[in-house]
């Protein structure tokens, strides 16, 4: 079957999810592709507890997450509702800044050096984090 009951090699298990932390950088779309080919997705942060877990692993390094507004509104890659969900933006962010001179604004979200979020140019080669959920059936204790 396609169910995952434990995390693959090089992945870290936390709260019934598996996380993979890159050591190099890719543009957001390339990082997104990478996670998909792992049957996973760029990390979706749904709580302060998850934010702290990811932050602890990535350290003070710009790192992509699965949040973007390339098609207008901000969206999480797994469909988690943005408006009602957890947010941890830096003050004054997101600002869709055009002053970088690279063309266009800023449509992809990343963890900054202090863990808070910023929107940036999607082409920047930042590290990234993949996440995949463990099979829900495997969460239930076996029947006695």
């Amino acid at each position: 079957g396609s169910e995952r009951t434990c995390c693959p090699v090089n992945w870290v298990e936390h709260e019934r999810s598996c996380y993979w932390f890159s050591r190099s950088g890719k543009a957001w779309a390339d990082a997104d592709n990478y996670c998909r080919l792992e049957d996973a997705h760029l990390v979706v942060v749904t709580s302060w507890e998850e934010q702290k877990f990811v932050q602890r692993h990535i350290g003070p390094v710009n790192t992509w997450m699965g949040l973007h507004d390339q098609n207008g509104p901000w969206k999480w890659v797994d469909g988690t509702d943005y408006e009602t969900g957890f947010k941890n933006w830096r003050p004054e962010q997101p600002d869709d800044w055009y002053g970088h001179g690279l063309g266009g604004g800023e449509d992809c979200a990343h963890f900054t050096d202090d863990g808070r979020w910023n929107d940036d140019v999607c082409q920047r080669p930042y590290r990234w984090v993949c996440e995949t959920e463990l099979d829900k059936a495997s969460q239930e204790p076996p029947l006695l």
Epitope: S2, N10, S24, K26, D30, R36, L37, E38, P125
Partner: antibody, heavy 121, light 107 residues
């Protein structure tokens, strides 16, 4: 030992279809992404497609997008390449290859011997 | 797409010679580079991955170096069985792309 064996090649007319198979043995097939790559004397090695472990996610070279479909059956340890609307320029030796476990990349670490596809009227 | 420029396209060497092949990527690919060997009628064989890591079972006369855009593959002392075509391959991003190949002949 780890082995990949391609089959299904042959001579086919332009516009027709062909399905290639790749039988895997000697490793846990469902734990690896898989590729198809082709080789022609003129263009050298050309990557064709990649599929994830479970088969949920796939990517294709622009030259085959919309015509070729990569798929897998993990219960049979087999990778497939369905090739439709074949063109003369699809003539090549087709290899399946295992995606290695390089940290953060898509590289191939094991290759099959290849199967030859000739598209000709 | 990332272009891979490999040189030379062919090389003739004597047994015991040191042979170097270079590969240049059109953009930064970190260390996501393989070197493969293809002998006539045989499957391709991975020799070096992650630019410099020797695949298990591959003789130590083969080595690789480089990062970013410039990479080098070296055979420190060519043996008769090394007659083959050698390819570099970037796997930083899809589409994966290959160098044009270097055909090694023995004098």
């Amino acid at each position: 030992q780890v082995q990949l064996v391609e089959s299904g090649g042959g001579v086919v007319q332009p516009g027709r279809s062909l399905r290639l198979s790749c039988a895997a043995s000697g490793f846990t097939f469902s734990s690896y992404g898989m590729h198809w790559v082709r080789q022609t004397p003129g263009k050298g090695l050309e990557w064709v497609a990649i599929i994830s472990y479970v088969g949920k996610n796939k990517y294709y070279a622009d030259s085959v997008k919309g015509r070729f479909t990569i798929s897998r059956d993990n219960s049979k340890n087999t990778l497939y390449l369905q090739m439709n609307s074949l063109r003369a320029e699809d003539t090549a030796v087709y290899y399946c290859a295992r995606r290695g476990n390089s940290y953060g990349g898509y590289g191939m670490d094991v290759w099959g011997q290849g199967t030859t596809v000739t598209v000709s009227s | 797409d990332i272009q891979m420029t490999q040189s030379p396209s062919s090389r003739s060497a004597s047994v015991g010679d040191r042979v170097t092949i270079t590969c240049q990527a059109s953009q930064d690919i970190s260390n996501y580079l393989n070197w493969c060997q293809q002998k006539p009628g045989k499957a391709l064989k991975l020799l070096i991955y992650d630019a410099s890591t020797l695949e298990t079972g591959v003789p130590s006369r083969f080595s690789g170096s480089g990062s970013g855009t410039d990479f080098t593959f070296t055979i420190s002392s060519v043996q008769p069985e090394d007659i083959a075509t050698y390819y570099c391959q970037q796997y930083d991003n899809v589409p994966i792309t290959f160098g044009q190949g270097t055909r090694l002949e023995i004098k």
